[in-house]
């Protein structure tokens, strides 16, 4: 039968300068002798002879005298090749060809690697730096193989991908020197890290530089608002919080504060030229003038209406600017439901009745749930309608049609999904014949 040759499926990884073993084995048949063996190692692509064993003898290295077999192990089927003092130029595929009577061959890949040095960092210019200045940071790492992957990140670990130029040059041994240049506009201060990764060794070499420039006369404005919607009851006052961090020496004359509706851009309230310009929104808004100088740009909205619901943008500019949107969620609690029954007298088990549950002046639209006396949900034959009045508040009417049992309790729960407020009503129908409401 055909001869089967085993080699590793994955590349053999060898560090430059070390020795590598390219494993290859075959299964000798009983009675096998080395006189029968013809073993050839050659470069897969060029077919250049590397090492051979023939006519019962090791024919030696044909590859810069840096290869050897394992003669004591050949008879057991170990045809591996030892490659000494690995060089970058050795990288590639080697074929192990074995013939006895039949023959077989397989190729094994040699992947050469060399670790990169710890990067050195340089800065240009390297003095009198101010926020807003453009600086060039160079990260250099030497004598690695194969080509590196270079990553830049800021102090928070966020990748910096723009304005990066990386060059890799191979020396006469084929090892790479990496130079990566990052051009950045300085913030108030910052740490810049360079990571040089050897993709084969999965080895990372890091360095970082922290730049604390002199304080600049300008800095980006960062506006803080609540992430969750502000929930306000209809008719009450709501505060839409917004704040910024004033720099030392900040004066209100420098402040330009604008509140506007996010979607329509309609002006709500503004503070410019050192003065509160007042409400442009039905005269129901106010700032907190005594707190503005400390960075409190919050807006007070009075007598909240359903129509106020939505997103408000707080825009702050001093020299630079920033903005963020805060959502206002309006709510109104639902009234305790009133229950009516139709027909409401001479009721007997088996009769179909219509129970109506009504709850008024809530917002937003309600969720309505029906259940029986045991708390089991009743979902069939329920019709719910919700109508908004001129203020935008909803009246809810939910109708349940049921066939009466011997007796029963039917409960209606009206839930306000924003306030998580539940309003309950229930009716108990007992005895026969029955009348509703029960007569005194």
């Amino acid at each position: 039968g055909a001869l089967e040759v085993q080699v590793p499926e994955d590349p053999v990884v060898a560090l430059v300068g070390t020795d590598a073993t390219l494993c290859c084995s075959f299964s000798p048949e009983p009675g096998f002798s080395l006189a029968q063996l013809n073993l050839i190692w050659q470069l897969t692509d060029t077919k250049q002879l590397v090492h051979s064993f023939a006519e019962g003898q090791d024919q030696g290295s044909a590859y810069a005298n840096r290869t050897a077999l394992f003669p004591d192990l050949l008879a057991q089927g170990n045809a591996s090749l030892r490659l000494q003092r690995v060089r970058v130029a050795d990288e590639g595929s080697f074929t192990c060809f074995v013939s006895i009577r039949d023959f077989g061959s397989a190729a094994v890949s040699l992947q050469v690697a060399a670790p990169y040095s710890k990067p050195s960092m340089t800065l240009e210019p390297n003095k009198d730096l101010r926020p807003g200045d453009t600086v060039t940071i160079t990260c250099s790492s030497y004598q690695g193989y194969p080509e590196a992957e270079v990553f830049w990140q800021d102090g928070q670990g966020v990748p910096l991908t723009g304005n990066v130029t990386t060059s890799q040059m191979a020396n006469e041994q084929g090892l790479f020197d990496v130079h990566s240049i990052l051009r950045v506009v300085l913030g108030a201060n910052g740490t810049y890290s360079c990571l040089v990764r050897n993709p084969v060794l999965q080895q990372d070499a890091h360095s970082s530089v922290t730049i604390t420039p002199q304080r600049s006369p300008t800095g980006a404005v960062e506006v803080q608002v609540p992430e969750d919607p502000v929930v306000a009851l209809v008719g009450t006052d709501a505060t839409l919080r917004c704040s910024f961090s004033p720099e030392p020496g900040f004066s209100l004359a420098q402040l330009n504060l604008i509140w506007q509706l996010t979607d329509t851009k309609q002006l709500v309230h503004s503070f410019t030229e050192g003065r509160d310009q007042g409400s442009a929104y039905a005269n129901r808004t106010a700032l907190f003038p005594d707190l503005l100088a400390q960075g409190n740009a919050s807006l007070r909205l009075q007598r909240v209406r359903v129509a106020d619901e939505g997103s408000f943008t707080c825009f702050v500019s001093i020299r630079d600017f920033g903005s963020a949107a805060v959502s206002l969620q309006v709510a109104a609690p639902y009234s305790k439901p009133s229950m009516t029954l139709e027909p409401n007298k001479d009721l007997r088990p088996g009769d179909t009745v219509t129970i109506t549950c009504s709850s008024y002046r809530g917002y937003p639209e309600a969720e309505v749930f029906w259940q029986d006396g045991q708390g089991v949900p009743l979902t069939g034959n329920v019709t719910t309608s919700q109508m908004a009045n001129e203020q935008g508040l909803f009246d809810v009417h939910s109708v349940l049609r049921v066939v009466l049992g011997a007796n029963g309790t039917y409960s209606c729960l009206v839930r306000n999904p924003v306030l998580q407020q539940d309003a309950h009503g229930s009716v108990t129908i007992t005895g026969q014949p029955m009348t509703f409401p029960p007569e005194a």
């Epitope: 928070q156 980006a220 404005v221 960062e222 506006v223 608002v225 992430e227 330009n256 604008i258 506007q260 996010t262 979607d263 851009k265 002006l267 503004s270 410019t272 997103s311 943008t313 825009f315 500019s317 630079d320 600017f321 920033g322 903005s323 963020a324 949107a325």
Partner: antibody, heavy 119, light 106 residues
């Protein structure tokens, strides 16, 4: 409807200045903010600066000292002047804006003006 | 400055595919983020503002989500006219654009 129409392409030598205009119609400059955004060939978008509806100017610190943005409300025109030009300033320059006093996103864009800087 | 990291830088997809593009910022920007579409030789076009609000006239197959530092633009079912470059933009602190994602036909 809202329109922003920009001046034509320019070829400049390094060290020179260029002034690009953007004439707006369909809205008043006193109710819209206008920004300038540039795009080098095959590259991304870079915000250069803005004029708010109230007339305040804001500049990207990268261009501070080299860029000036002005407006003429009587002719509804906004101007962007970039000085000390270098080859890396070769780009398409867009004027862009939106309603409101708060500078934020841009619903309206000009057609772009190609500025080529070459010796 | 707030750094914007947009990924992937390029993407191949077919008509009808669902496509997601992400934008990550170096610090929280709440929902102060917009998305644009740009076709060669044309000005960008606003798709989404405030992270998830659809601009008037934009088809509903475009949607935006996210808040804080991680944002996503989703095209639910790619149409031939959607092959273009997409940019994110923050307006929380100053203005910055992402580096762009080129959406190509597979």
């Amino acid at each position: 409807q809202v329109q922003l129409v920009q001046s034509g392409a320019e070829v400049k030598k390094p060290g020179a200045s260029v002034k690009v205009s953007c004439k707006v119609s369909g809205f008043s400059l006193t109710s819209y903010h206008v920004s300038w955004v540039r795009q080098a060939p095959g590259q991304g978008l870079e915000w250069m600066g803005a004029i708010s509806s109230g007339g305040s100017s804001y500049y990207n610190s990268k261009f501070q000292g080299r860029v000036t943005m002005t407006r003429d409300t009587s002719t509804s025109t906004v101007y962007m002047e970039l000085s000390s030009l270098r080859s890396e300033d070769t780009a398409v320059y867009f004027c862009t804006g939106d309603l409101g006093a708060a500078i934020s996103w841009f619903a309206y864009w000009g057609q772009g003006t190609l500025v080529t800087v070459s010796s | 400055d707030i750094q914007m990291t947009q990924s992937p830088s390029s993407l191949s997809a077919s008509v009808g595919d669902r496509v997601t593009i992400t934008c990550r910022t170096s610090q929280s920007i709440y929902k102060s983020l917009a998305w644009y579409q740009q076709k060669p030789g044309k000005a960008p076009k606003l798709l989404i503002y405030n992270a998830h609000s659809l601009q008037t006239g934009i088809p509903s197959r475009f949607s935006g989500s996210g808040s804080g530092t991680d944002f996503t633009l989703t095209i639910s079912s790619l149409q031939p006219e959607d092959f273009a470059t997409y940019f994110c933009q923050q307006y929380y602190s100053g203005l910055t654009f992402g580096s762009g994602t080129k959406l190509e036909i597979k």
